[in-house]
């Protein structure tokens, strides 16, 4: 057993300017941090729970955001973040640190939380070692922090697996550690076997070389995945042509907490009892009380403490702990070939030419998406649209004023007048009709349609607007 400790030294803009949050805080704010620990170094750890534990810091001092940018370094919460772990410290782990901002305004439903930054690092760390310092960038933010893993007595060693119970109350001096079992003194850390990998190995006893998870071989230089077939060295199996190990990997049952061990090629596998998991069943079941759901996810536990928890994630996040941002553009919300831009706080569609609307859903080349102004009518055809404009208007959308007399529609010297409902021809003597197209006989009777009742030859003739269109 032991405790992982994280100390945040500073959080603020990295070199190159002050970050702008995608959220604009309206009132006072304060920071807090979340830490999540996952065993192992594999890429799939991103989707796994915080199996080694999770912790939430206290809230930091209240500060007020400046309109232009945050203060150079934002005020931090006091104290360490501590994540207790049971049983063995795995040595290799993934560290996830989230910086959250809490807005203390008058929002409905209490303070608003927003994630400012998130760093994920895969690390190797022996328990009992010194503080390890780190500086990480998250977008335009910079986070400075230190961390260590320490065992809690009676556990000792780089994996906190060795139990040591001193029989006296003697205290160990600098550089010394609690005594070995059944001894009443302090001892110097053991000197490992010569050549034992500093990165992948450790020792509890002088001259030994024990391997961290994922490594094997006398000096812990061989990855587990390649250790089962070492070719011609050593006795080989007639069936596999692979090295037959001396002692079996399940010897001594490496599975903790009542787990059962079964051999696999070059390694072993633990079948864990309900409530435990991990490579060696060393991790006790995480519950909602451990706060495993990130990014505002809602934790729902089972009927009993051994049941797995489930995180119900808010929009924009996924993963068993809501720790992974959804690629919202993968849902292809933009229609008609528009470009999806995920701006964090919003999605935006940038449309191709000829399309418009929040999701590029309006085709500007069809009548459904466009109205013709000034009484014009939309006519579709050939995948495009055109406006048939009322008299006196023209242009793509009938928004431009047009001169109905520009085409000189009045025949035989008739004079054209623009009228609100169309054009009017004032015919020269001897002509009549809408365009003065009909000559008048000397006896006053027209050769073609008679003038409407009450309309004398020579009177202005109105030209109905529905005969005249501007096509574009």
């Amino acid at each position: 057993a032991g405790v992982f400790e994280l100390q945040i030294h500073s959080f603020g803009p990295g070199p190159g300017g002050a970050p702008r949050s995608p959220y604009s805080a309206r009132g006072p704010c304060r920071l807090f941090f979340r830490v999540c620990l996952k065993p192992g170094l594999s890429e799939e750890a991103a989707e796994s729970p915080c199996a080694l534990g999770a912790a939430l810091s206290a809230r930091g001092p209240v500060y007020t955001e400046q309109p232009e940018a945050p203060a150079p370094d934002l005020p931090l919460p006091n104290g360490l973040l501590q994540v207790p772990f049971r049983d063995a410290w795995p040595g290799t782990f993934s560290l996830i640190i989230e910086t959250w901002r809490e807005e203390l305004g008058d929002q409905i439903g209490g303070p608003a939380w927003s994630l400012l930054a998130r760093v994920t690092r895969r690390r190797r760390l022996a328990a009992g070692g010194p503080w390890a310092g780190d500086i990480q960038r998250a977008g335009a933010w910079e986070l400075r922090f230190s961390y260590r893993a320490r065992c809690e007595l009676p556990a000792v060693g780089t994996a906190c697996t060795r139990l040591c119970r001193p029989r006296s109350a003697s205290r160990c001096g600098p550089g010394l550690r609690p005594c070995a079992p059944l001894e009443d003194e302090c001892e110097a850390p053991p000197v490992c076997r010569a050549g034992c990998s500093l990165e992948h190995g450790f020792c509890e006893q002088p001259g030994e070389c024990r391997c961290l998870e994922g490594w094997t071989g006398p000096l812990c230089m061989v990855p587990v995945s390649t250790s089962s077939c070492l070719g011609l060295r050593g006795p080989s199996s007639t069936t596999t042509g692979c090295l037959v190990p001396g002692p079996g990997p399940c010897d001594g049952n490496p599975c903790a907490n009542g787990g059962s061990c079964s051999e696999t090629p070059g390694s072993f596998e633990c079948t864990c009892p309900r409530g435990f998991y991990g490579l060696r069943c060393e991790v006790s079941g995480v519950t909602c009380a451990d706060g495993p759901c990130f990014n505002g996810g809602l934790c729902v536990g089972g009927a009993d403490p051994d049941s797995a928890y489930i995180c119900h994630c808010p929009p924009g996040f996924q993963g068993s702990n809501c720790e992974k941002r959804v690629d919202r553009c993968s849902l292809q919300p933009c229609r008609n070939g528009g470009l999806c831009l995920d701006l964090g706080h919003a999605l935006r569609c940038r449309c191709r030419a000829g399309f418009a609307g929040p999701r590029c859903e309006h085709d500007l080349n069809d009548c459904a998406g466009r109205a013709c102004a000034n009484g014009g009518t939309c006519v579709e055809g050939g995948g495009a649209h055109r406006c048939s404009c009322a008299l006196g208007f023209g242009g793509r959308d009938c928004r431009e004023r047009a001169d109905p007399c520009a085409a000189r529609p009045c025949a035989h010297g008739g004079r054209c007048y623009a009228h609100f409902s169309g054009l009017v021809c004032a015919c020269a003597p001897g002509y009549m009709g809408a365009r003065c197209e009909f000559p008048v006989h000397p006896d006053g009777v027209s050769a073609l349609p008679a003038a409407p009742p009450g309309l004398r030859p020579g009177d202005p003739q109105r030209y109905p607007h529905h005969h005249h269109h501007h096509h574009h």
Epitope: R20, G139, C329, G337, L339, C340, L341, L343, A353
Partner: antibody, heavy 122, light 107 residues
């Protein structure tokens, strides 16, 4: 800090090909749409092409459509512009740039590379 | 395609002058407009985004305004380092289009 560095420019004959690269650092490359913009000597700026963060969507200016291909390798944090059937009027400094939509999200560093000169001449 | 008409194309001004440059879009582009400054042989430098938001690190004498089709870049008191060419860019829809540029020269 955001940094963009173009390479691959040079002298090429009309009808020839060239491939420009843009190495990105200081930001999560795969999350951002990227652009190529060019500037002919003594002239204004002209947008050439855009690619989405995933690389699944591409957009081109009419002047280069069918001749240029934009692509990206997110595992290498690199943007590319394959230019075929080059013409004298393609002579320009080519810049890679983070899409302007993100100007209020990222702040540190340069959103445009320093540019690489492409000269098309016989 | 959206055309961006920038005016004037060139102007002479003195240190301390108030300078105004206009960009007109052929159709509405909301506030999807950015302004850039470019000096000879240099990379365009972003000044304004979202029509009126000042980019971090840019002096406050620069300001932008407008929405829809009419946009303005204003330099409240011209400084010696401000003599350069200024471009607007619309990124409302494809194809992205730049204004023709305004060269601000010393009177």
């Amino acid at each position: 800090e955001v940094q963009l560095l173009e390479s691959g420019g040079g002298l090429v004959q009309p009808g020839g090909s060239l491939r420009l690269s843009c190495a990105a650092s200081g930001f999560t490359f795969s999350s951002y749409a990227m652009n190529w913009v060019r500037q002919a000597p003594g002239k204004g700026l002209e947008w050439v092409s855009t690619i989405s963060g995933s690389g699944g969507s591409t957009y081109y200016a009419d002047s280069v459509k069918g001749r240029f291909t934009i692509s990206r390798d997110n595992s290498k944090n690199t943007l590319y512009l394959q230019m075929n059937s080059l013409r004298a009027e393609d002579t320009a400094v080519f810049y890679c740039a983070i899409d302007p939509e993100y100007y209020d999200i990222l702040t540190g560093g340069d959103y445009w590379g320093q540019g690489t000169l492409v000269t098309v001449s016989s | 395609d959206i055309q961006m008409t920038q005016s004037p194309s060139a102007m002479s001004a003195s240190v301390g002058d108030r300078v105004t440059i206009t960009c007109r879009a052929s159709q509405g582009i909301s506030n999807y407009l950015a302004w850039f400054q470019q000096k000879p042989g240099k990379v365009p430098k972003r000044l304004i985004y979202a029509a009126s938001s000042l980019q971090s690190g840019v002096p406050s004498r620069f300001s932008g305004s407008g929405s829809g089709t009419e946009f303005t870049l204003t330099i409240s008191s011209l400084q010696p380092e401000d003599f350069a060419t200024y471009f607007c860019l619309q990124h409302d829809s494809f194809p992205l289009t730049f204004g023709g540029g305004t060269k601000v020269e010393i009177k």
